[in-house]
């Protein structure tokens, strides 16, 4: 009762390999690395057949089919290029993930190269089967400032030079504060922007005083104060978080985070700002931007900006001592002694940024918080100091530069 000679499948083998097979002999069909046994349209690792009493085999020899990793997973803010001709997705094929430059960059400078493994999954040498991450690039505007003029007594900003600025607007279209885009879905603003004015008789901040996420929207890519254009993105708000140590009476820790309902599309007009890497040096020049009131109490048509120096903390404390106002460590001051250049009503929450010349990258120093009138002599603008609350911001948002 000898069974016919067996031919192993292409890209496969038969074990044990014998010259002759007799009744009750069993053979195991397996495939080379990168191939799977295919029998009746079912993929398996091995297939066993047996020599029957009547001298026939219990089954036909299956075929060996090359492993297919199928279409690779889509990468958010990324692209896929196939290194193999005809966009092959079979064993040993190679693909490369890349991020949508120049607005996204791959985390940890990963190569993005994935190979189709024998197990039928796309594998990267470092990340294994996990996909890479495309992080938003921060602080690198496509449009750079042409010149720096030495908000209140400011000058119009060039379109696209402040792509991180956000306008907080009531749903009816009335703007009320500024903010800055952090990462891909967070806005940092002033905490006092997100609640109603408190009763001087009972200045306690209650939940009922807070602005509901459904009461306002965020506008990114904005240049004109009231006019709109197609570069703008009007986005809903998911959640607001005020700093746990915020004091509405003294404006200590006047910082809040707004989570967007959806991430904006990053482009030449919408890009996040970088978080500060260290403390800010006094005397350093910073730029403050906003749509707040101008000279003669008029609102500007377009985004305005001023360039002013950071002021020594003790100088600022002395300036506000006669007004019985405390300038605490979580605040940073800027402006010129003679006044004239300052943030004003409507600028609150907006960005104060500085340029790291070595990296050519812009960093957030502070957010517009408070002051005595606008542009007054010997009265500097007071800003919420981002470096002081950076840990809290990173804990809430997960944003890293």
């Amino acid at each position: 009762n000898e069974c016919p000679e067996l031919q192993p499948p292409v890209h496969g083998k038969i074990e044990p390999s014998q010259a002759k097979y007799f009744f009750k002999d069993q053979v195991l069909v397996s495939c080379d690395t990168g191939y799977k046994v295919l029998k009746d349209n079912v993929e398996m690792d091995t297939f066993q057949i047996e020599c029957l009493k009547d001298g026939t085999w219990s089954n036909k020899i299956p075929t060996c089919k090359i492993v297919d990793c199928r279409a690779p997973g889509e990468l958010e803010h990324g692209l896929i290029t196939f290194s193999t001709r005809n966009n092959l997705t079979t064993y040993k094929s190679e693909i490369k993930y890349s991020c949508q430059e120049p607005y996204y960059k791959m985390l940890n400078n990963n190569t993005g190269i994935y190979t189709c493994s024998a197990q039928g999954v796309w594998m990267n040498k470092v990340l294994g089967r996990s996909l890479p991450t495309c992080l938003p690039v921060c602080g690198l505007p496509k449009f750079s400032r042409k010149l720096m003029a030495r908000i209140f007594n400011g000058r119009p900003a060039q379109k696209g030079t402040t792509p991180w600025i956000a306008m907080l607007s009531h749903l009816n279209g009335q703007p009320f504060c500024g903010g800055s885009l952090l990462g891909s879905s967070w806005i940092v603003t002033a905490a006092h922007c997100l609640h109603q004015s408190l009763d001087p008789e009972d200045p306690t901040l209650r939940d009922s005083d807070l602005l509901s996420p459904s009461d306002f929207k965020i506008i990114l890519g904005k240049h004109w104060r009231l006019r709109s254009d197609e570069n703008e993105q009007h986005l809903g708000v998911k959640h607001t978080t005020l700093h746990p140590q915020y004091d509405p009476n003294t404006f200590e820790n006047d910082v809040a985070l707004v989570e967007l309902l959806e991430s904006p599309v990053l482009n030449a007009f919408v890009m996040p700002i970088c978080l500060p890497e260290g403390p800010q040096q006094e005397g350093a020049m910073v730029i403050v931007s906003g749509w707040g009131k101008q000279f003669l109490q008029r609102f500007p048509e377009t985004l305005m900006e001023i360039e002013i120096p950071i002021v020594d903390h003790s100088t600022c404390q002395k300036a506000y001592a006669p007004l019985k106002k405390k300038v605490t460590r979580d605040m940073i001051c800027a402006g010129e002694k003679e006044g004239g250049k300052d943030a004003c009503a409507g600028d609150a929450g907006g960005p104060m940024v500085t340029l790291n010349r070595e990296r050519g990258q812009w960093y957030l120093v502070g957010t517009v918080s408070w002051g005595d009138d606008c542009g007054k002599k010997d009265r500097y603008g007071v800003y919420s100091y981002i470096h002081h609350n950076k840990d809290w911001i990173q804990r809430v948002t997960g944003v890293r530069n």
């Epitope: 009816n172 459904s214 709109s228 197609e230 993105q233 009007h234």
Partner: antibody, heavy 120, light 111 residues
């Protein structure tokens, strides 16, 4: 940049019909698209809205589920069912001036319209 | 739905004169209103949004005002080219609804 409607034709009452709005020169996913209709010699009538990126839709109350706005990767469709002679009109799709689902900056980009005639 | 009541339904004006069209919303929509111009056989054209902001390329003789429930479109120094039908529209958006209802239209004729 432009939008253009297609699919309008003569149909008998009760026949379903799908109109398509195709965008050129911009990513339709980043803007809210509205459908508006105008019966012969009459005023403009708002049908509804879609923000393609999130798929969120809103309709005028008179629509009562007869019309559905949906998106494909590059177009926005208006599916119409239970058509009556009252639905005879030129149908426009229009894009909001600014991007994002919360833009209420007016409809700045209109298609030429496509005529739907419902007649037995 | 929000109801937009537009008045008058038609108006006649002399070249150089002033035309005022009013629109009343059935509920407070803040500054969320727009105005359109439509000439026979043409698609509508955005003229004003945000109650008072002039759309790009629109002549400065057109102006919009109002908020809440009352809105006005004014054409100062009317020209022959302004003969058209004008529509107001609610651009109301909240986290729970979107409304784009139009007013009934005002036909402007030039004498």
């Amino acid at each position: 940049q432009s939008v253009e409607e297609s699919g309008g034709r003569l149909v008998t009452p009760g026949t379903p019909l799908t109109l398509t709005c195709t965008a050129s020169g911009f990513d339709i996913n980043n803007y809210a698209i509205h459908w508006v209709r105008q019966a012969p010699g009459e005023g403009l009538e708002w049908i509804g809205y879609i923000y393609a990126r999130s798929g969120v839709t809103w309709y005028a109350s008179w629509v009562k589920g007869r019309f559905t706005i949906s998106k494909t990767s590059t177009t926005v469709d208006l599916k119409m069912t239970s058509l009556t002679t009252e639905d005879t009109a030129t149908y426009f799709c229009a894009r909001v001036l600014a991007g994002g689902g919360y833009a209420n900056t007016g409809l700045s980009l209109w298609g030429p319209g496509t005529l739907v005639t419902v007649s037995s | 739905d929000i109801v937009m009541t537009q008045t008058p339904s038609s108006v006649s004006a002399a070249v150089g004169g002033t035309v005022t069209i009013k629109c009343q919303a059935s509920q407070n929509i803040g500054y969320s209103s727009a105005w359109y111009q439509q000439k026979p056989g043409q698609r509508p054209k955005l003229m004003i949004y945000g109650a008072s902001t002039l759309a790009s390329g629109v002549p400065s003789r057109f102006s919009g005002s109002g908020s809440g429930t009352e809105y006005t479109l004014t054409i100062s120094g009317v020209q022959c080219d302004d003969a058209a039908t004008y529509y107001c529209q609610s651009n109301y958006i909240s986290s729970g609804s979107v409304d784009g209802t139009f007013g009934g239209g005002t036909k402007v004729e030039i004498k």
